[in-house]
Interface confidence: medium
């Protein structure tokens, strides 16, 4: 359905508040360094223009595409060249190249300060202007997460304001706010990572990769839905994600609302779990659908082997419509196995496809593919064994100790990767233990494998910006579904030339004594990475000795009366003993 004015159409569909929020998110994701007030000004200008177009669709400029309107606003920013450098060159291009250019300049790791929640200050700001407070949240999250799923960010901003509505009345604001903000922060970070993986899937592997992922996920959630229902939703959902990943946030939010309506209109055919979602307002409804629990697997489903191994017509069915046949295999496998990770289901489908490619070219295809399900078994056993082994390690050493084991493991695999990235990734990997190892057996695999996919995607995104390791590039680019097994298979990189010893990472001052525990851990873990970069073949015993010396040194100096004096005098001794221990 074509509209004379796209901007008027979206303004009418979304309403003024959501329109403004989405425009603010879009600008903040493109211009990540601009101050909030600058963005507010741009949003106001575009909102006024949209209202003009609502009143008169044939007003000058109202027929322009949203990319043209957005891009023109971005290119008006006076400090574009000095703040963003060659991003300003995008403004010399025409659409659609101009928007592509802006997208390519999104920074996944912008140098922005860590946000520290100060309850009294935040409550004062909230009470002074709730709308501005809501906008500031959108802005701060969007600029730090330039691929955040925009309509979902609107949902979180509303939730965030709700928390302040409740807690700023409380006697102890901090006690009420901080745990809620922390819990929300975790959810927001996970949401950001999920969307980043979706966008990377589309950008690096094409929309077929995202469609396959969505087929598996939705088949697990809606196992009683038929294949055509699942593929219809997957097609619409892929369009929504393509739009959001491409910066078309107004279309994305609008289409997401339509999809939520479709799902609720057809909930009887999809899942008994949707009832609780479908009475909610649109943003909450969409969020609820995305998070909905898996419905029970229907009883009496025939065994998979009937259609996909025993049937003599498998090759005929496959060759007539490869994507549909493989899609139905993925659907049928996924709906029967809610206890499998999506990434594992995708590996099963990939290997099944490879088997058919091989077998269907043979004299007796049936004899060849009849045993395919035996061949697939190792794809389920491998992650199960890995999870068992790593959860045992986690249970033995706790989160911090497990993180340190992962730091050793991953620094040896990819010592060329920057130290902050290795620390960040290993810390995240270590948190998988806390998040997943306590879960029941039926949830352990989806929890670990799918969470690992998010973390390894973060590594791939950061590494792509400054590629330093051929092994990492290979694991990141060869196969989306096999990324985790690829990283698991990496061993010590023998091509790596060790770094000279860098004293800087063993230069400590009295400020370490007052750091929060997390930051203290990061300092120690940074030192551990640097040790390994200097001596990748250091034994676990040597590393243990050095780290124990280091902890003793910090403890001793932090207990001293003259803390800094202690660091000044004992620091060089630590450096010397470290070098001696590694000699």
């Amino acid at each position: 359905d074509t509209h004379k004015s796209e901007i008027a159409h979206r303004f009418n569909d979304l309403g003024e508040e959501n329109f403004q929020g989405l425009v603010l998110i879009a600008f903040s994701q493109y211009l990540q360094q601009c101050p909030f007030d600058e963005h507010v000004k741009l949003v106001k200008e575009l909102t006024e223009f949209a209202k003009t177009c609502v009143a008169d669709e044939s007003h000058a400029g109202c027929d322009k595409s949203l990319h043209t309107l957005f891009g023109d606003e971005l290119c008006k920013v006076a400090t574009l060249r000095e703040t963003y450098g060659d991003m300003a060159d995008c403004c010399e291009k025409q659409e659609p190249e101009r928007n592509e250019c802006f997208l390519n300049h999104k920074d996944d790791s912008p140098d922005l300060p860590k946000l520290k929640p100060e309850p009294d200050t935040l409550c004062a700001e909230f009470k002074a202007d709730e709308k501005k407070f809501w906008g500031k949240y959108l802005y701060e999250v969007a600029r730090r997460h330039p691929y955040f799923y925009a309509p979902e960010l609107l949902y979180y901003a509303n939730k965030y304001n709700g928390v302040f509505q409740e807690c700023c009345q409380a006697e102890d604001k901090g006690a009420c706010l901080l745990p809620k903000i922390d819990a929300m922060r975790e959810k927001v970070l996970a949401s950001s990572a999920r969307q980043r993986l979706r966008c990377a899937s589309i950008q690096k592997f094409g929309e077929r990769a995202l469609k396959a992922w969505s087929v598996a996920r939705l088949s697990q959630k809606f196992p009683k839905a038929d294949f055509t229902d699942v593929t219809k939703i997957v097609t619409d959902l892929t369009k929504v994600h393509k739009e959001c990943c491409h910066g078309d946030l107004l279309e994305c939010a609008d289409d997401r609302a339509d999809l939520a309506k479709y799902i609720c209109d057809h909930q009887d055919a999809l899942s008994s779990k949707l009832k609780e979602c479908c009475d909610k307002p649109v943003l909450e409804k969409s969020h609820c659908i995305a998070e909905v629990d898996k419905d029970a697997v229907p009883e009496n489903l025939p065994p998979l082997t009937a259609d996909f191994a025993e049937d003599k017509e498998v090759c005929k069915n496959y060759q007539e419509a490869k994507d549909v046949f493989l899609g139905s295999f993925l659907y049928e496998y996924s709906r029967r196995h809610p206890e499998y990770a999506v990434s594992v289901l995708l590996r099963l489908a990939k290997e099944y496809e490879a088997t058919l490619e091989d077998c269907c070219a043979k004299e007796d295809p049936h004899a060849c593919y009849a045993t395919v399900f035996d061949k697939l078994k190792h794809l389920v056993d491998e992650p199960q064994n890995l999870i068992k082994k790593n959860c045992e390690l986690f249970e033995k050493h706790g989160e911090y100790g497990f993180q340190n084991a992962l730091i050793v493991r991953y620094t040896r695999k990819a010592p060329q990767v920057s130290t902050p990235t290795l620390v960040e990734i290993s810390r995240s990997l270590g948190k998988v233990g806390t998040k997943c190892c306590a879960k029941p057996e039926s949830e352990r695999m989806p929890c670990t494998e799918d969470y690992l996919s998010l973390i390894l995607n973060r590594l791939c995104v950061l590494h792509e910006k400054t590629p330093v390791s051929e092994k990492v590039t290979k694991c990141c680019t060869e196969s989306l579904v096999n990324r985790r097994p690829c990283f698991s298979d990496l061993t010590l990189d023998e091509t790596y030339v060790p770094k000279p010893f860098d004293e800087k990472f063993f230069t400590f001052h009295a400020d370490i004594c007052t750091l929060p525990d997390t930051e203290k851990q990061i300092k120690k873990q940074t030192a551990l990475v640097e040790l390994l970069k200097h001596k990748p073949k250091a034994t676990d015993e040597q590393l243990k000795t050095v780290m124990e010396n280091f902890v003793a040194f910090v403890d001793k100096c932090c207990a001293a009366d003259d803390k800094e004096g202690c660091f000044v005098l004992e620091g060089p001794k630590l450096v010397a003993s470290t070098q001696a221990a590694l000699a």
């Epitope: 010893f501 004293e503 800087k504 063993f506 230069t507 001052h509 009295a510 400020d511 000044v568 620091g571 060089p572 001794k573 450096v575 010397a576 070098q579």
Partner: nanobody, 119 residues
Framework: EVQLLESGGGLVQPGGSLRLSCAAS????????MLWVRQAPGKGLEWVSV????????YYADSVKGRFTISRDNSKNTLYLQMNSLRAEDTAVYYC????????????WGQGTLVTVSS
């Protein structure tokens, strides 16, 4: 090769002020923490102040806290020590040093600048 060149010392009356400078070369100054140490006549080395590579945080020995201020200009590869309310016991040769060293002594430091506080 690492070079550290201190300047700004001299004779000053008690209660007076001096500003010491240390020009650095031969290493990446902006990634190195730096410190001032001093040696009074017939005494051992005493650390005075440390500054982080970014300029903050800074640290001071109790004996100079509130009177001395350490600072740096990374664009000029220069370290400073502003000394106010000087006392006779501040008399010493002042050295700037790269912190820490790989051995149990400060192996990168300059030739020093003498500060004499006397009436």
């Amino acid at each position: 090769e690492v070079q550290l060149l201190e300047s700004g010392g001299g004779l000053v009356q008690p209660g007076g002020s001096l500003r010491l400078s240390c020009a650095a070369s031969g290493f990446t100054f902006d990634t190195s923490s730096m410190l001032w140490v001093r040696q009074a006549p017939g005494k051992g080395l005493e650390w005075v102040s440390v500054i982080h590579q970014s300029g903050t945080p800074t640290y001071y020995a109790d004996s100079v806290k509130g009177r001395f201020t350490i600072s740096r200009d990374n664009s000029k590869n220069t370290l400073y020590l502003q000394m106010n309310s000087l006392r006779a016991e501040d008399t010493a040769v002042y050295y700037c040093a790269k912190f820490p060293s790989s051995r149990m002594k400060f192996d990168y430091w300059g030739q020093g600048t003498l500060v004499t506080v006397s009436s």
